[in-house]
Interface confidence: low
């Protein structure tokens, strides 16, 4: 005998107190699926999360972050603070990237410069802590007089953020 | 020394524009937000918006959309905030503020632009 | 907008006395909230910022506490200096708003 409970569309749940008719989810929760026996309840996205798409009787809600804060994990399940370009996030908060490293992104780490000489290159454009190096070509593909290239102007020192 | 020097009193007519700087000195601005806040003759603190010198984007409270405009200068670490059809409600000192958006927000300070509008 | 509802509106104390103010947020705030000390005349003050965490050379007599909507701030016991108005402020988001204000005066 077929389950009679596979009849009910998604949006409905299979209701054992009603003699398994199918029965519309509640407010405030959902059934992606035929067949299901409860409904599941929307997420919240509440505090330092955003509603991104409304929960409806067939779909979750989906939550992203409030401005200044970027998404994490699966689904959006943790947001993280923005920093700056050229700052990394620590537990003290948002920090400037050290002389020598570089973060192009509101999130993740500062990373070191790339090392132009261990591909047997020159540095063509200094690093900043916003940006990492340019490699130029190798020093000997460079003849005296033949170069168009400037000399990269020194690196800027990281500026200070008050703290 | 990190130091927020702002403009002098103005006073202005009713539906005037004035338009208040905000020199930095002592850090570099593109690090950091700067933030308008005003008070009103007796009254509370009140969130103007934010500029982030680095690229000019700006966040402005609802409350003042259209009204205002925040520019920067980083030639001369200066920021302006500029605000359109003044009327008397719009009378208040007009503080700008800075600090790491999450670490320690607002944490330094212009001494503030007194700003009357009066016909 | 998330409204921020300060009080007492005005609170009067003796210097020695513990006094507590608070902000309840009008939704949960995460931990974006601080704390500034107004005096006439002055620019606002920061004094602890993420709740609870104090700024350099804020005195041990100052400390914040609380969670998702509702704060507090605590003066431990007042000092003659501490008579001025105290402003709460959430930043989770924009706009950023600040509490009504308690003004502490002398008894």
């Known amino acids: 005998l077929q389950d009679p409970c596979s009849n009910c569309p998604a949006g409905t749940f299979c209701d054992n107190n009603r003699n398994q008719i199918c029965s519309p989810c509640p407010p405030n929760s959902f059934s992606s699926a035929g067949g299901q026996r409860t409904c599941d309840i929307c997420r919240q996205c509440k505090g330092v999360f955003r509603t991104r798409k409304e929960c409806s009787s067939t779909s979750n809600a989906e939550c992203d972050c409030t401005p200044g804060f970027h998404c994490l994990g699966a689904g959006c399940s943790m947001c993280e603070q923005d920093c700056k370009q050229g700052q990394e996030l620590t537990k003290k908060g948002c920090k400037d990237c050290c002389f020598g490293t570089f973060n192009d992104q509101k999130r993740g780490i500062c990373r070191p410069w790339t090392n132009c000489s261990l591909d047997g290159k020159s540095v063509l454009v200094n690093g900043t802590k916003e940006r990492d190096v340019v490699c130029g070509p190798s020093p000997a593909d460079l003849s005296p007089g033949a170069s168009s290239v400037t000399p990269p102007a020194p690196a800027r020192e990281p500026g200070h953020s008050p703290q | 020394q990190e130091q927020l020097v702002q403009s002098g009193a103005e006073v202005k007519k009713p539906g005037a524009s004035v338009k208040a700087s905000c020199k930095a000195s002592?850090?570099?601005?593109?690090?950091?937000?700067i933030h308008w806040v005003r008070q009103a003759p007796g009254q509370g603190l009140e969130w103007m918006g934010r500029?982030?010198?680095?690229?000019?984007?700006?966040e402005y409270a609802q409350k003042f959309q259209g009204r205002v405009t925040m520019t920067r200068d980083t030639s001369t670490s200066t920021v302006y905030m500029e605000l359109s059809s003044l009327r008397s409600e719009d009378t208040a000192v007009y503080y700008c503020?800075?600090?790491?958006?999450?670490?320690?927000?607002?944490?330094?300070w212009g001494q503030g632009t007194s700003v009357t509008v009066s016909s | 907008d998330i409204q921020m509802t300060q009080s007492p509106s005005s609170v009067s104390a003796s210097v020695g006395d513990r006094v507590t103010i608070t902000c309840k947020a009008s939704?949960?705030?995460?931990?974006?909230l601080s704390w500034y000390q107004q005096k006439p005349g002055k620019a606002p003050k920061l004094l602890i910022y993420?709740?609870?965490r104090k700024v350099d050379g804020v005195p041990s007599r100052f400390s914040g506490s609380g969670s998702g909507t509702d704060f507090t701030l605590t003066i431990s016991s007042l000092q003659p200096e501490d008579f001025a108005t105290y402003y709460c402020?959430?930043?989770?988001?924009?706009?950023?708003?600040f509490g009504g204000g308690t003004k502490l005066e002398i008894k």
């Open positions: 402020l959430q930043y989770l988001d924009f706009p950023y708003t």
């Open positions: 503020t800075t600090g790491n958006l999450h670490y320690a927000l607002m944490d330094y």
């Open positions: 939704q949960p705030i995460n931990t974006y």
């Open positions: 002592g850090f570099n601005i593109q690090d950091t937000y």
């Open positions: 500029i982030d010198p680095a690229n000019g984007n700006s």
């Open positions: 993420r709740v609870n």
